[in-house]
């Protein structure tokens, strides 16, 4: 029961996390114009991974897509790649974990197979969460660097009577959504991995018990039974942990980030 709850909760948490990663990736507010200590402008600039927007006090908002691929900063490309890899891994992880859920019966699927799939999806969720956290953190670091550079340049340049206002950007809502979503996906993945341990089938091995009946002996070897039948006093339960060996290869077999840029 606890295993099913852990697995189910891990799935739900990961689902919320991946939905958050998708939302963060699509959001326009990765960086927003810093309003602190700035002249009051009637426009508000904000930027996402795919386009930049300007909201005017008139109520009019104009967004322009980044219609170039080669002209974009390498860091932005890297963040895009990390987020997309995170989404793809997360989506595949969700698909795998649906079939791995203990509460869902699909044909005559063995518990060992479900355990394997749970572990696989768990690792995928962990990697997905790490990709999202890494992507958001790289972008945040880029913002911090640019912020201090533009602060240093703020009062230099034109000279004389004419002044140019340097637009500085700070953390947007998408960064916080991304960090939280990545964390949730990571936690969900860990929960799936924990659930995997309890999902492995219990195999009961019994020592052969001989019954001597008049004149001839018949040996019963009930080692194949799943549940204990009370034969003999040397009953020994052994948990089998199958899985884990293949998951590394499975994770590596999914497309690399470069396939999505």
């Amino acid at each position: 029961m606890a295993v099913t709850a852990c697995q189910g909760l891990g799935f739900v948490v990961s689902l919320i996390g991946i939905a958050g990663i998708i939302a963060a990736t699509c959001m326009d507010q990765w960086s927003t114009q810093d309003l602190y200590n700035n002249p009051v402008t009637a426009v508000f600039n904000y930027q996402g991974l795919w386009r930049s927007c300007v909201r005017e006090s008139s109520g009019f908002t104009e967004c322009r897509g980044y219609f170039t691929l080669l002209g974009l900063p390498a860091m932005l490309q890297a963040v895009r790649a990390l987020m997309i890899v995170g989404i793809v891994l997360g989506a595949i992880g969700l698909l795998v974990s649906i079939f791995a859920l203990k509460c869902i019966r699909i044909g005559s699927m063995e518990d060992s197979a479900k355990a394997n799939m749970t572990l696989t999806s768990g690792i995928m969720f962990i990697v997905s969460g790490l990709c999202a956290i890494a992507g958001v953190s790289v972008f945040a670091n880029m913002l911090v660097t640019n912020f201090w550079m533009s602060t240093a340049n703020m009062y230099t340049g034109m000279g004389g009577m004419v002044q140019t206002v340097q637009t500085r950007y700070t953390f947007g809502a998408a960064l916080f959504v991304g960090w939280v979503a990545g964390g949730l996906t990571l936690i969900g993945g860990v929960m799936m991995c924990i659930a995997c341990r309890g999902l492995a089938p219990e195999e009961t091995n019994y020592k052969a018990v001989s019954y001597h009946a008049s004149g001839h002996s018949v040996a019963y070897k009930p080692g194949g039974f799943k549940a204990s039948t009370g034969f003999g006093s040397n009953t020994k339960n052994k948990k089998i942990y199958d899985g884990g060996a293949r998951t590394e290869d499975e994770v590596q077999s999914y497309p690399s980030k470069h396939d999505y840029v």
Epitope: P39, A42, S57
Partner: antibody
């Protein structure tokens, strides 16, 4: 068709108060920034106040800050300018205008005259 | 506050001739976010409210004749009427739409020579 009709102008003594109204029609009132612009007799245009579209932030020049208040009633599709502590230099034709892209003002009312005199 | 300075204060041009009005702002009106200049030009005829001609420094408002054009970037802007018509006699104002408080130029009175 966008229509803006100002009302509430008139003669007022210095230190007095007046409330201008602007009835708007032909567009989604809450979505657009609205402004008041005035023009003293024989003089140029002077921006008086703006209430931004959507979030309804308000902005004023130093010359009227603390004395004038811009507001809107979405239910009535009306824009208001509450003018307190009026001075002789506030005498002007007050125009209500709706903004659009570039924060420009493509739509204007015909104006209402406010005269501050003892 | 941003100071908008128009030149000349008044201008007399013959019908069919080119009229040029300049506007200078004390700070750049170029927004780096969309690379647009937040400068607007208005025309005002006696007894009428102002009429929007040009926004974003160079984008003509719909319904405005194509003889009107705007140019410039940063701090220096120009309104050009390529071939003056009798109905173009009016006062022309430039306006900063980037910084609060929004400020207008003092106006340029255009007359027929």
């Amino acid at each position: 068709e966008v229509q803006l009709v100002e009302s509430g102008g008139g003669l007022v003594k210095p230190g007095g108060s007046l409330r201008l109204s602007c009835a708007a029609s032909g567009f989604t009132f809450s979505s657009y920034g609205m402004s008041w612009v005035r023009q003293a007799p024989g003089k140029g245009l002077e921006w008086v106040s703006t209430i931004s579209g959507g979030d309804s932030y308000t902005y004023y020049p130093d010359s009227v800050k603390g004395r004038f208040t811009i507001s809107r009633d979405i239910a009535k599709n009306s824009l208001y300018l509450q003018m307190n502590s009026l001075r002789a230099e506030d005498t002007a034709v007050y125009y209500c205008a709706r903004s659009y892209n570039a924060n420009s003002l493509p739509y204007w009312g015909q104006g209402t005259l406010v005269t501050v005199s003892s | 506050d941003i100071v908008m300075t128009q030149s000349p204060d008044s201008l007399a041009v013959s019908l069919g001739e080119r009229a040029t009005i300049n506007c200078k702002s004390s700070q750049s009106l170029l927004n780096s976010g969309n690379q647009r200049n937040y400068l607007t030009w208005y025309q005002q005829k006696p007894g009428q409210p102002p009429k929007l001609l040009i926004y974003w420094a160079s984008t003509r408002e719909s319904g405005v004749p194509d003889r009107f054009s705007g140019s410039g970037s940063g701090t220096d802007f120009t309104l050009t009427i390529s071939s003056l018509q009798a109905e173009d006699v009016a006062v022309y104002y430039c306006q900063n739409n980037y910084f609060y408080p929004f400020t207008f130029g003092q106006g340029t009175k255009l007359e027929i020579k």
